[in-house]
Interface confidence: low
């Protein structure tokens, strides 16, 4: 691998609809890890500062952004779902967490480094009760 | 797996203000229904994934669709999939 | 959009007290988290304490039993009661308020802390 072109993620959250909590009484949150380089990272949900697995389901694997390019750069989604009433909790904060294998981008790179930095990039969103 | 009531739904949801990527929600739909990749190169979808949520005894499938780009909507993201008409729900503007 | 704005900083001696406040205003009612945050020079920026809207607090550990954060909800304020301050405590110190998504994340400009016989 090219260790100039490294790119960590961009990692964004996404609230859920009104209109599934409405219909369904549950609500997906989602969350985009996206414009990586390599594809090694790792997923994860915390709740109220806890990991959690029920309720998550992420992308086996990353997916490439532009598939023709030998290079592309990476992107990988989850998405957590939860009960109505937990989302509306205010007092309840959800994050994404995305831990990414390689160089920040201000980060130096010096060939003598034997392993990459492990970096954590997340994106949090609360509960609403309200607007 | 086995989706017990399937109820197939597209869902708009929203990031921050400063956020230009939109995305998209195929959510509750049937297990022999296939999620297609876009033709178009600045859409990305996700192949179908299936969602635990064990606490409520529930399983559902899910696939994502996103882009940056401004005209992107909900209702074209999977045109091919084959989505039913009434599977789309709007956004109500947020009044926040 | 959300203003912060600190102050409370200084010059102290080692073993004395200030008390740190931030005013947040603007949408102040879609903030559920404050933080204070310190940065010392020629080092990165690390957390001191949390508190979230339930008025749940978070410290990091070498602020745990010296400092105190508590907040005035009427004031949209939040302080930062620092006791037996060290020398190693010396940093611009930053208030962080998040929203209720992601990334509404909000800092202010800092106030320093000096502590020095």
């Known amino acids: 691998e090219d260790l100039k072109k490294v790119f960590p993620p961009k990692v964004a959250v996404f609230e859920p609809s009104e209109a599934e909590i409405s219909h369904t009484q549950k609500a997906t949150l989602v969350c985009l890890a996206t414009g990586f380089y390599p594809d090694h990272v790792e997923l994860s949900w915390w709740v109220n500062g806890k990991e959690v697995h029920s309720g998550v389901s992420t992308d086996p694997q990353p997916l490439k952004e532009q598939p023709a390019l030998e290079d592309s750069r990476y992107s990988l989604s989850s998405r957590l779902r939860v009960s109505a009433t937990f989302w509306h909790n205010p007092r309840n904060h959800f994050r994404c967490q995305v831990q990414f294998y390689g160089l920040s981008e201000d980060d130096e790179w010096t060939e003598d480094r034997d392993k990459p930095i492990t970096q954590k990039i997340s994106a949090e969103a609360w509960g609403r009760a309200d607007c | 797996p086995y989706i017990q009531n399937p109820d197939p739904a597209v869902y708009q949801l929203r990031g921050s203000k400063s956020n230009d990527t939109s995305v998209c929600l195929f959510t509750d739909f049937d297990s022999v229904m296939n999620v297609s990749q876009s033709k178009d190169s600045d859409v990305h979808i996700t192949d179908k994934t299936v969602l635990d949520m064990r606490s409520m005894d529930f399983k559902s499938n899910g696939a994502v669709a996103w882009s940056n780009k401004s005209d992107f909507a909900c209702t074209s993201a999977f045109k091919d999939s084959v989505i039913p008409a009434d599977t789309f729900f709007p956004s109500p503007e947020s009044s926040c | 959009d959300v203003q912060l704005v600190e102050s409370g900083g200084g010059v102290v001696q080692p073993g004395g007290s200030l008390r740190l406040s931030c005013v947040a205003s603007g949408y102040v009612h879609k903030i559920n988290f404050y933080g204070w945050y310190r940065q010392a020079p020629g080092k990165e920026r690390e957390k001191v304490a949390h508190?979230?809207?339930?008025?749940?607090?978070d410290y990091a550990d070498s602020a745990k039993g010296r400092f105190t954060i508590s907040r005035d909800e009427s004031k949209n304020t939040v302080y930062l009661q620092m006791n037996s301050l060290r020398p190693e405590d010396t940093a611009a110190y930053y208030c962080r308020a998040l929203s209720r998504i992601w990334p509404y994340d909000y800092w202010g400009q800092g106030t320093l802390v000096t502590v020095s016989s």
């Open positions: 508190i979230s809207i339930g008025d749940q607090t």
